[in-house]
């Protein structure tokens, strides 16, 4: 393993459509991939009138957008379906939405709002 990199070997698995898809609804998914490829976990969810509905959670594979992310954070502003990915075993147990704001006139004391966490 490369120093400082969190190896992902398993992720929290969830499938909202488990009855329709006839799979387990929740569990632990082992992540497989080529030895030279990185493995990640992901979470995807919807915000229906302020209520969080998880769609899927599980393994995600070698995606530069997920590199070195220890926390699962969605940064896109108001997507239809929220998505985040991260590195480290079961790192998708918790996920958050923290949109990157357009940089306007900086204040002398910028405040970083704490992202809401879901699990």
């Amino acid at each position: 393993a490369i120093l400082g990199r969190s190896e992902t070997q398993e992720c929290l698995f969830f499938n909202a459509n488990w009855e329709k898809d006839r799979t387990n609804q929740t569990g632990v998914e082992p992540c497989y991939g080529d030895k030279d490829k990185r493995r990640h976990c992901f979470a995807t969810w919807k915000n229906i009138s302020g209520s969080i509905e998880i769609v899927k959670q599980g393994c995600w594979l070698d995606d530069i957008n997920c590199y070195d992310r220890t926390d699962c954070v969605e940064k896109k502003d108001s997507p239809e379906v929220y998505f985040c990915c991260c590195e480290g075993n079961m790192c998708n147990e918790k996920f958050s939405y923290f949109p990157e704001m357009e940089v306007t006139q900086p204040t002398s004391n910028p405040v970083t709002p704490k992202p809401p966490y879901y699990n």
């Epitope: 387990n24 082992p30 497989y32 393994c59 995600w60 594979l61 239809e80």
Partner: antibody
Framework: QVQLVQSGAEVKKPGSSVKVSCKAS????????ISWVRQAPGQGLEWMGG????????NYAQKFQGRVTITADESTSTAYMELSSLRSEDTAVYYC?????????????WGQGTMVTVSS | EIVMTQSPSSLSASVGDTVTITCRAS??????LAWYQQKPGKAPRLLIY???PLSSGVPSRFSGSGSGTHFTLTISSLQPEDFATYFC?????????FGPGTKLEIK
């Protein structure tokens, strides 16, 4: 070497059944998602269903519900797809495929395909 | 059922060209979009999964982008071995559905 090796070509009569086998090697068969996809001559691709052997229960496309049965034998790392009440439109190449993840991220390892011809 | 459409259905190009194939989903599929290449008499080959990451062993001249309902596959500096049929597939919700394919031919 990661591979899926399928059984040979079949010629069947309308109304009969066919069972295609798919032997896996080089990966963790029991905890992998194995799907079946078919392709009629000169046509596109059609997903039929799939299963994760440790879960045991297959997930089928509505179109094939009641006519297709997907099973797996963990002891021999072999998946099976049985299609019943065959009709001429079922003439196609049938592929077994390994998915990258349980959430169907992509079909990365394909069998060589099994040609099933339905003809009277 | 989510319906996938591809455009164009066929196109002619020359070695060295850059081509773009578009795939649209009838409803949002987030990032659950894969691209496959198929040559006559062969099984399809996974090129791209999750809308943009490249599958193992796929040359970097292939790239994918998009999310939701609109996706593209771009092949830059076409090589002779790239002339084939390309399919997109959504795996966001069952039944997982494929586009009708785009046949890439040599001009």
């Amino acid at each position: 070497q990661v591979q899926l090796v399928q059984s040979g070509a079949e010629v069947k009569k309308p109304g009969s059944s066919v069972k295609v086998s798919c032997k896996a090697s080089g990966f963790q068969f029991r905890t992998s998602l194995i799907s079946w996809v078919r392709q009629a001559p000169g046509q596109g691709l059609e997903w039929m269903g799939g299963l994760i052997p440790i879960f045991g229960t297959a997930n089928y496309a509505q179109k094939f519900q009641g006519r297709v049965t997907i099973t797996a034998d963990e002891s021999t790392s072999t998946a099976y797809m049985e299609l019943s009440s065959l009709r001429s439109e079922d003439t196609a190449v049938y592929y077994c495929v390994k998915d990258l993840t349980w959430t169907n991220l992509g079909l990365d390892i394909w069998g060589q395909g099994t040609m099933v011809t339905v003809s009277s | 059922e989510i319906v996938m459409t591809q455009s164009p259905s066929s196109l002619s190009a020359s070695v060295g060209d850059t081509v773009t194939i578009t795939c649209r989903a009838s409803q949002g599929v987030s990032r659950w979009l894969a691209w496959y290449q198929q040559k006559p008499g062969k099984a399809p080959r996974l090129l791209i999964y999750g809308a943009s990451p490249l599958s193992s062993g796929v040359p970097s001249r292939f790239s994918g982008s998009g999310s939701g309902t609109h996706f593209t596959l771009t092949i830059s500096s076409l090589q002779p071995e790239d002339f084939a049929t390309y399919f997109c597939q959504q795996s966001y919700s069952t039944p997982f559905t494929f586009g009708p394919g785009t046949k890439l031919e040599i001009k």
